[in-house]
Amino acid sequence: IPTEIPTSALVKETLALLSTHRTLLIANETLRIPVPVHKNHQLCTEEIFQGIGTLESQTVQGGTVERLFKNLSLIKKYIDGQKKKCGEERRRVNQFLDYLQEFLGVMNTEWIIES
Amino acid sequence: IPTEIPTSALVKETLALLSTHRTLLIANETLRIPVPVHKNHQLCTEEIFQGIGTLESQTVQGGTVERLFKNLSLIKKYIDGQKKKCGEERRRVNQFLDYLQEFLGVMNTEWIIES
């Protein structure tokens, strides 16, 4: 069992492994996986990890490619934990409105919005 | 029925209305609403809109506060539409890996990650 590494380091390592194993992963020419059509990635985590599951089931395991899928599974675990934290703390309306304002502000400035 | 306005303009208008009606909205001293504990807002859209629903049911309607909740409902509709687009297009592994790489890249640079 590997020593637990920070999620940020885990993401960096996973990006490197993804690059390393790209040729092996794309070997299946006929496989089709759902790909989101926009860049608001966080809205699509469920579909992204379903796609990863499909890819894993079609990939010959062994060596560091196993490490890649293990990492992706840990990233999923982290995101699932973040999703749990969406509704854990009950606060006054004031605080909810401040969060809502921040959410809309980020949507206004950072989301890729197509009308 | 109002002329459909671009989502970006809708978000801006909603931010202004939120500010205008803040005093009315916070009048309920004892109401508690779940507030996410992190800034990865897109992961929490479901909880945010549940909170908006709770707030709407506790707020005396009329005038432009109604417009605020109507706008928030249109924003929810837009986000639901974006979520639908997460799994509509099936693509080759190559394209899925590009999206995954971009997702992890954004996670690496833009997400607020607490280990």
Epitope: E88, E89, R90, R91, R92, N94, Q95, D98, Y99, Q101, E102, G105 | T23, I26, A27, N28, E29, T30, R32, V35, P36, V37, H38, K39, I112, E114
Partner: antibody
Framework: QVQLQESGPGLVKPSQTLSLTCTVS??????????WSWIRQHPGKGLEWIGY???????YYNPSLKSRVTISVDTSKNQFSLKLSSVTAADTAVYYC?????????WGQGTLVTVSS | SYVLTQPPSVSVAPGQTARITCGGN??????VYWYQQKPGQAPVLVVH???DRPSGIPERFSGSNSGNTATLTISRVEVGDEADYSC???????????FGGGTKLTVLG
């Protein structure tokens, strides 16, 4: 377990600006469920709320101090700060930083600031 | 702005019941929070949302709130309960925090 630690000079001259920083450990200052607050207590007196800030930068100040107070947040350092301008001897107090959910959950140990020439 | 009024001091013998009041206009419609502060220490929450106790706070501490008065009740008072007690509410019209002036609880004997 969230811990807060105030830091800054213990002595400030009249008419100058009092500056304090609160460092948060054991939790993120970007936690959407918390505000970050400053409270003070004059010697032998009750608690006086100074103001609070949200991670997004929204601030709320005590009306009696509003014209002199600035609270800011630095999410990269997990810190928030207090500046109180044009101080007088009446600003001599123990200054506390605290996390504020529905109530004040966690407090710093407090730092005594004396205003004197 | 909203004002909370507390008696400056309350004295009680060990084993007796202490009642500390906090007065405010229609305070019964607000949530009240009570803090205990011992000399040289930071305050500690002893009651939240009128009558709820945080974990670790003895059952001897209880609260009530109605009309224009909230009350912190400490039954079977112990010497270790000697401290300052402050009430706190939110002023929802401005979203400001309001503290009472504090009450010094003295345990006699």
């Amino acid at each position: 377990q969230v811990q807060l630690q105030e830091s800054g000079p213990g002595l400030v001259k009249p008419s100058q600006t009092l500056s304090l920083t609160c460092t948060v450990s054991g939790g993120s200052i970007s936690n959407g469920a918390y505000y970050w607050s400053w409270i003070r207590q004059h010697p032998g007196k009750g608690l006086e709320w100074i103001g609070y800030i949200y991670y997004s930068g929204s601030t709320y100040y005590n009306p009696s101090l509003k014209s002199r107070v600035t609270i800011s947040v630095d999410t990269s350092k997990n810190q928030f700060s207090l500046k109180l301008s044009s101080v007088t001897a009446a600003d001599t107090a123990v200054y506390y930083c605290a996390s504020l959910g529905n109530w004040f959950d966690y407090w710093g140990q407090g730092t005594l600031v004396t205003v004197s020439s | 702005s909203y004002v909370l009024t507390q008696p400056p001091s309350v004295s009680v013998a060990p084993g007796q019941t202490a009642r500390i009041t906090c007065g405010g206009n229609n305070i019964g419609s607000k949530n009240v929070y009570w803090y205990q502060q011992k000399p040289g220490q930071a305050p500690v929450l002893v009651v939240h949302d009128d009558s709820d106790r945080p974990s670790g706070i003895p059952e001897r501490f209880s609260g009530s709130n109605s009309g224009n008065t909230a009350t912190l009740t400490i039954s079977r008072v112990e010497v270790g309960d000697e401290a300052d007690y402050s009430c706190q509410v939110w002023d929802s019209s401005s979203d400001h925090v309001v503290f009472g002036g504090g009450t010094k609880l003295t345990v006699l004997g």
